[in-house]
Amino acid sequence: ASTQSPSVFPLTRCCKNIPSNATSVTLGCLATGYFPEPVMVTWDTGSLNGTTMTLPATTLTLSGHYATISLLTVSGAWAKQMFTCRVAHTPSSTDWVDNKTFSVCSRDFTPPTVKILQSSCDGGGHFPPTIQLLCLVSGYTPGTINITWLEDGQVMDVDLSTASTTQEGELASTQSELTLSQKHWLSDRTYTCQVTYQGHTFEDSTKKCADSNPRGVSAYLSRPSPFDLFIRKSPTITCLVVDLAPSKGTVNLTWSRASGKPVNHSTRKEEKQRNGTLTVTSTLPVGTRDWIEGETYQCRVTHPHLPRALMRSTTKTSGPRAAPEVYAFATPEWPGSRDKRTLACLIQNFMPEDISVQWLHNEVQLPDARHSTTQPRKTKGSGFFVFSRLEVTRAEWEQKDEFICRAVHEAASPSQTVQRAVSVNPGLAGGSAQSQRAPDRVLCHSGQQQGLPRAAGGSVPHPRCHCGAGRADWPGPPELDVCVEEAEGEAPWTWTGLC
């Protein structure tokens, strides 16, 4: 076996086990794990007399190394005295020595918890010019503690006079603060608060977190839009993965079907974001019939920074079905904007929430970018509603003053569409509606208890309409209000107009 220096441990009794009238006590020192023999153990007993006895070395069976115990028996005023056991092992080195200083007995104590806290970054997430580290030494039995700060394992020259100790009940807490320059903190060094207490060492370390803490990768899987499903008859589903570290293509998106049948060829798109992450979308064409019949599709995402693959699945929404109600209206002329008008479309009480909204002019569908449509939101009942807004120009309405708001939804019959026509100047052009009864469109005037129905043929007073105070679930601007036509013998219907 090669030369090995000893590990040295003090051997003491518990103070509570020593009779208060004891005139002499024995303590010891264990030197273990050394090779070869011998070790020399000497004692410093201070002003007290003592007798020592070193036991013969024993061989540790597994390693072949040696262990020995030296015992010291002292008499007199031993309670307040500290004793030093000095172990020398010349085979390791002529000057190899380990000293252990300790008292006759060990008291029961609660060891401290050591925790380093650090000051916050500024509001922009940047480090301030100086960084404070606070070492909290808490919950220990009151007694002497020594705090040392280390930088990469080297003792730092720190003013420890600022350390403060408080006592709560039977336990004490101490805290020590270290102030670092930003340069030191950013240099990736490790800072350690080391606490010595009752002959034991406790510590906590910290350093600036690495730049490369992986952010949370998220994956989302969309259902096909009703427009793609029922009108274009070429539905697709999209798996969207965001906040990826851009590892040059190591993100894998794999499609599968619950039925085990093969999937179509998917198309993949990658987009680099300004926050340094990658967004990956994979679009999979699905069969209209497969989707309607309830097939489940799965997207599996693997990436080096994911501890395990992300799985997302999608299928046709289950539950009750309800066709949408569609109401369209035009805002009145606004001073200063005579050549532009806003058309609005409220689509409500449909289930499930998947819906596509389109605007048509001259039998031509307008590009999606022309209109803005809210996400479906729940109504007070069990259905959903959306609101769509379209800006039109004078040139458009002078060419043909009829614009159609169309909703595509699976519960709409006969052809999964419901639409409503609206005119900028309703007195000049009639609106038309398909797939549902067209209730009278009512314009309410604020302060009036009754409104005026606006039918193609002209204006007739309408006694069964009153202005409400606005619907809580209506996302539009505050001047929009709700009229309720309390039609006899029919369920009341609501329409949102200007009051």
Epitope: S212, R215, P246, S247, K248, T250, K272, G276, T277, P304
Partner: antibody
Framework: QVHLVQSGAEVKMPGASVKVSCKAS????????ISWVRQAPGQGLEWMGW????????NYAQKLQGRITMTTDTSTSTAYMDLRSLRSDDTAVYYC????????????WGQGTLVTVSS | DIQMTQSPSSLSASVGDRVTITCRTS??????LNWYQQKPGKAPKLLIY???TLKSGVPSRFSGSESGTDFTLTISSLQPEDFATYYC?????????FGQGTKVEIK
Amino acid sequence: QVHLVQSGAEVKMPGASVKVSCKASGYTFTSYGISWVRQAPGQGLEWMGWISAYNGNTNYAQKLQGRITMTTDTSTSTAYMDLRSLRSDDTAVYYCARDGDYYDPFDYWGQGTLVTVSS
Amino acid sequence: DIQMTQSPSSLSASVGDRVTITCRTSQSISNWLNWYQQKPGKAPKLLIYGASTLKSGVPSRFSGSESGTDFTLTISSLQPEDFATYYCQQSYSTPPTFGQGTKVEIK
């Protein structure tokens, strides 16, 4: 601390092959890609290709396609770059570099390996 | 491939000077631009990534900015250890491409 240590300098005859190694330490090897970048004497930096230490996927510069192979050995956290049919204009210092997480920079570099191609 | 045009190709400056190096890209790369410093006989070292984010441990006298397809590396007060060659690199599309370098020499 992240370290990339490359193999020593090589002198090769035209038409020969060279294999440069790059041993990584101080981070989880399979969580990052390794790129190889070369620099001819007195010239700028040229990206040669990339390999994923995660799954071995590769992406090579078009001008080197067919002559270059990149591999990894995850058991030793080592990346290799093999360049065949060497020409005199392949004389350069070859660097391996780790691909950083966000914005894909080369955040840590090996010390470089000088490969001299001469008859 | 995206072309990177760095200017100037070299400059002479004194300790304490403010130094600016620019890099223009042939097409939009968002802010996916990185700056490196290389000293003779040594490997390049990453200074700035994402156009303006300082790598941990890099002195704060280095800063980066962007304006469309123009990117700037600024050394606010040149130190003796800053005399080196600086390269810009785009990581927006494959292959990643580097500028031809700017050598900062002692005046």
